[in-house]
């Protein structure tokens, strides 16, 4: 019989219900925005905005300062007071729409939903390792701003994204705001604009460049700005917007907008459609060719990637990649496939596609009928003409006008659908050693820290834990402070180490020591932990073998048993080859001689399951007693594996030595031609791994084996005669003298 060790699911080596408590701060209201600052003198701060209030926290998340940012019109509003005596606009709550650092000063800039979306600049004042905010400066000059032209109106109540770029000794605010007809009519924020902060911090320079959704499209064409970032020579905005100005406005897709970070102008504004799909390795019947589209971006982050992922993406290590979490629609719930998918768009590739798109539009020969696009921002036109014009005039350049690139950039889910039902609501990507890790917040208030690789059919978790008991969604914006990430959920801010909150969710020594080096996990006798958790017994270099099962559970006291041991950390090498003298198995007092691995039995074990098998031949010593005993596996002097060496002992109870007894055999005669069904009765007849009924030295083919009975078919006899009949268990004869008589057929 060919018994095989049962598979252990890979998930059994970890427990994601383990509770981790990470430092947190209760903000006293729903967190609306959060940003971090790290100075060069070890001073750092976390700025947390809620309705009508801005908190300044130290690196330990303790409150350092708190500032009233509303309600507008309230005498207690500290930011409002910076604008001089009011009234400055209609009274009302201030919801923070923008919270960014101006890298030039440094200073914090906050912009809210009240007071026409104006901003306030707070110089940073280091005090030891903490930072305080100086009295706010009101970035609003009343005499420069009108409802139809307001350089100081930055934030839209519908949402605004800002990236601040330092150019020379000046700060340029790259601003993208969601608009509708009502918002556009009230102190006219623009869809996309570049604003220069005035030297005296009294507001923004009056001459600023902007693009806005044309009035006729404001009602039907809504652009949501999901993320913005600056890398290299460009600032990028990521949007979710209707795929067409003329078609169904609920048919959405995702675009990347690119603006120059070195020339503060919008002539080289470019857009590119980002296409993210789930393409299962085995396509279902009826599933769309090329995979299922996930057109709506939920969150995004750009980061340099580690060596392994870089190789898989065919780019150089350290290159910047835009990662996006996409869903099928605004509600996020798909029909089939995972709830969330993650696609990776290398920035260099994005730039190349955009540049090629510009060439197609502007270089002869231009494909007839190729549109410049962006008809919601500008008059329709065909390439290479400028917007609204029939032809290029000599002093204009095709390249100096906004353009939608005619091709899209398509990518497939890095996780191959493995996020399953998880709804990702926050994303931050870091490079740790040569590993790229996605830190994701979820709809149900969990943090998933997962290695970003595309070649596997399972997720490589750093951690998966619940931030708290509220189960509220983790918010979109994540900030980094040193070796920690700050996530917001509900009214709380949580500080999560980038290397994971701990190691206790790894349940086995092998899984513990196979964890990434950056996690700092070690084995503490019977649990996985970081050194500070168990300084006494903590070690990272070896694991004992772990026996989980063996077969059979009993063997004959005389004769041998082929024992199969199941468990983990037997070999550390897939081949399962055991160097001489490293593995010692004893059953009771008796040794069990290791057997060479039968290469014909080797089968690939998928990483989602794991099990190791070890076989040995058990020959009980003469001193061995009948009865229950332990199986013990000791491994010593094993050469180290990639992550650790195997060293130690594992003991499992439940083996019994038994003495088989043969009580009766019938019938005691049969035809010489053979085929008589013999029934042997006794006790412990099924112990061990081998048994044989011999009739005159020839095997009687066993048809059934049980503890009390064996059935076999006699072999043909040479002559009519009485011949010896014996039972061997494990190669040793069971006591008793029996004969079988062959008769004429």
């Amino acid at each position: 019989e060919d018994w095989q060790c049962p598979r252990t699911p890979y998930a059994a080596s970890r427990d994601f219900d383990v509770k981790y408590v990470v430092p947190s701060f209760s903000a006293g209201g729903l967190v609306q925005a959060m940003v971090t600052y790290e100075g060069d003198r070890n001073e750092s701060a976390v700025f947390v905005a809620i309705r009508n209030r801005l908190h300044v926290l130290g690196p330990d998340l303790k409150s350092v300062q708190s500032l009233a940012t509303g309600p507008a019109g309230d005498p207690g509003c500290q930011t409002c007071a910076a604008c001089g005596p009011g009234p400055h606009g209609p009274p009302g709550d201030t919801d923070t729409k923008v919270l960014v650092l101006d890298p030039a000063l440094p200073a914090l800039v906050s912009c809210g939903s009240s007071l026409q979306g104006r901003c306030f600049l707070h110089d940073l004042e280091p005090q030891g390792t903490a930072v305080h905010l100086a009295a706010p400066a009101c970035l609003f000059s009343a005499h420069h701003n009108r409802p139809d032209d307001c350089p100081d109106c930055v934030a839209s109540p519908l949402g605004t994204r800002v990236t601040v770029v330092e150019q020379g000794q000046a700060s340029y605010f790259y601003v993208a705001s969601s608009l509708d007809a009502a918002v556009a009519a009230s102190f006219s924020p623009r869809s996309v604009s570049i604003r220069r902060l005035k030297a005296d911090a009294s507001g923004f320079a009056p001459g600023f460049v902007a693009l806005s959704v044309l009035p006729k499209h404001l009602v039907s064409y809504s652009i949501e700005y999901v993320h913005s970032f600056h890398t290299g020579a460009f600032v990028y905005f990521l949007t979710v917007q209707p795929a067409s100005v003329t078609d169904d406005p609920s048919a959405l897709h995702t675009r990347l907008a690119r603006l120059s970070a070195t020339e503060p102008e919008l002539g080289d504004y470019r857009e590119l459609v980002l296409d993210c799909r789930f393409a299962p390795k085995r396509r279902r019947r009826g599933a769309p060719e090329g995979g299922q589209p996930y057109p709506v971006l939920r969150v995004a982050h750009s980061a340099p990637v580690g060596a392994q992922l870089a190789t898989e993406l065919s780019i150089a290590e350290g290159q910047e990649v835009l990662f996006g979490v996409f869903v099928t629609g605004k509600d996020g719930g798909p029909g089939v496939g995972p709830n969330s998918v993650v696609c990776a768009f290398p920035i260099d590739l994005l730039d190349t596609l955009i540049d090629e798109g510009v060439e197609r539009c502007c270089e002869s020969p231009v494909h007839p009928g190729l549109r410049r696009g962006l008809d919601f921002f500008q008059s329709p036109s065909f390439c290479p003409n400028p917007p609204g014009l029939e032809a290029l005039s000599p002093n204009t350049s095709c390249r100096h006008f906004p353009l939608l690139v005619s091709s899209s950039f398509s990518r497939v889910d890095l996780f191959n659908g493995l996020l399953g039902p998880v709804q990702v609501t926050a994303l931050y990507v870091t490079r740790l050693d040569n590993v790229t890790v996605a830190h994701m917040g979820t709809m149900d208030g969990r943090i998933l820290q997962v290695e970003l690789v595309r070649s596997l059919n399972y997720l490589l978790y750093v951690s998966n834990f619940s931030l708290g008991d509220s189960g509220q969604p983790v918010q979109r914006d994540v900030s980094r402070l040193g070796d920690h990430l700050l996530f917001a959920s509900g009214d709380q801010v949580f500080q999560v180490p980038i290397q994971g909150p701990g190691c206790r969710h790894f349940l086995t020594c092998g899984r513990c020591l196979r964890a990434w080096h950056f996690m700092g996990c070690g084995w503490c006798g019977n649990m996985c932990g970081q050194q500070k958790e168990c300084p006494g017994s903590w070690q990272q270099d070896h694991c004992p073998p772990k026996l989980t099962e063996f077969h059979p559970h009993s063997g004959p006291l005389r004769g041998s048993t082929r024992l199969t041991l199941c468990g983990s950390n037997f070999y550390l090498h897939p081949s399962g080859l055991v160097p001489e003298g490293t593995h010692q198995v004893t059953v009771g007092q008796s040794p069990c001689r290791p057997l060479p691995k039968d290469s014909s039995k080797l089968r690939p074990v998928p990483r989602k399951d794991f099990v190791e098998e070890f076989e040995c031949e058990l020959e009980p010593l003469g001193t061995q007693a009948v009865g229950p005993t332990n199986v013990s596996l000791t491994v010593t002097n094993m050469p180290p594996g990639k992550h650790f060496r195997v060293d130690g002992t594992s003991v499992l109870r439940g083996f019994s030595f038994m003495e088989p007894v043969l009580i009766a055999v019938q019938p005691l005669f049969g035809p010489r031609a053979g085929g008589t069904c013999l029934t042997l009765e006794g006790q412990s007849l099924s112990v061990g791994t081998s048994r044989a009924v011999l009739v005159n030295g020839t095997e009687c083919l066993l048809a059934r084996v049980s503890e009390g009975q064996l059935l076999c078919a006699t072999p043909p006899g040479a002559t009519v005669a009485s011949v010896p009949l014996s039972l061997q268990v494990g190669g040793a004869q069971v006591p008793g003298s029996w004969t079988f008589q062959y008769r004429e057929d």
């Epitope: 060069d40 000063l105 440094p106 110089d123 000794q169 030297a199 320079a205 009056p206 001459g207 600023f208």
Partner: antibody
Framework: QVQLQESGPGLVKPSETLSLTCTVS????????WNWIRKPPGKKLEYIGY???????YYNPSLKSRVTISRDTSKNQFSLKLSSVTAADTAVYYC???????????WGQGTLVTVSS | DIVMTQSPLSLPVTPGEPASISCRAS??????????MNWYLQKPGQSPQLLIY???NQGSGVPDRFSGSGSGTDFTLKISRVEAEDVGVYYC?????????FGGGTKVEIK
């Protein structure tokens, strides 16, 4: 009140490296831009370059190959190094602070450096 | 680089009288609706001090008698009523393009 004070040798030999330090008091170099400007005899003020609070630098292209500006936040100082000097580098060297747009609101007293063998 | 030209080179003044210094840039120094022109005064034996930034904004602690105007390429610094302490060399500086560049200076002295 922010005060700046230049220090360094007043005489440097040709082909050697001119090194000056600007010590800032009454304010921190962890904010704003920290500039070097020079005035050769009988010539216009010439902008050399800056280092920002974050360590970002800019150098005048005419001097770029020879200039290094660095800072030491623990001492609240920033420094200028100008290599391979010639007599044309003889000037009064000033350090200055600006908050925005190269508008320098605080200046050091200036130090005369003569390049001569 | 943008070349800055000041005139006059020397300006004898009478206390209590107005005075005016001109500065011309070799190209427009306006952008974003702002003129990137700064004015400095270097008093005898002292380092320069910022008088005017962005063409018309007074520096911190600068007396009201100093004002700046102009746009494009032509700019003017006015002293409404000269005082004895106003003597020294006045410099204009553009900061629209890098490197920032200075005028040659105008020496103001009491008649």
């Amino acid at each position: 009140q922010v005060q700046l004070q230049e220090s360094g040798p007043g005489l440097v030999k040709p082909s050697e490296t001119l090194s000056l330090t600007c010590t800032v008091s009454g304010g921190s170099i962890s904010s704003g831009y920290w500039n070097w400007i020079r005035k050769p005899p009988g010539k216009k003020l010439e902008y050399i370059g800056y280092i920002s609070y974050s360590g970002k630098t800019y150098y005048n292209p005419s001097l770029k190959s020879r200039v290094t500006i660095s800072r030491d936040t623990s001492k609240n100082q920033f420094s200028l190094k100008l290599s391979s000097v010639t007599a044309a580098d003889t000037a009064v060297y000033y350090c200055a602070r600006s908050k925005y747009d190269y508008a320098m609101d605080y200046w050091g007293q200036g130090t005369l450096v003569t390049v001569s063998s | 680089d943008i070349v800055m030209t000041q005139s006059p080179l020397s300006l004898p003044v009478t206390p209590g009288e107005p005075a005016s210094i001109s500065c011309r840039a070799s190209e427009i120094v306006d952008n974003f609706g702002i003129s990137f022109m700064n004015w400095y005064l270097q008093k005898p034996g002292q380092s320069p001090q910022l008088l005017i930034y962005a063409a018309s904004n007074q520096g911190s602690g600068v007396p009201d008698r100093f004002s700046g105007s102009g746009s494009g390429t032509d700019f003017t610094l006015k002293i409404s009523r000269v005082e004895a302490e106003d003597v020294g060399v006045y410099y204009c500086q553009q900061s629209k393009e890098v490197p920032p560049t200075f005028g040659g200076g105008t020496k103001v002295e009491i008649k």
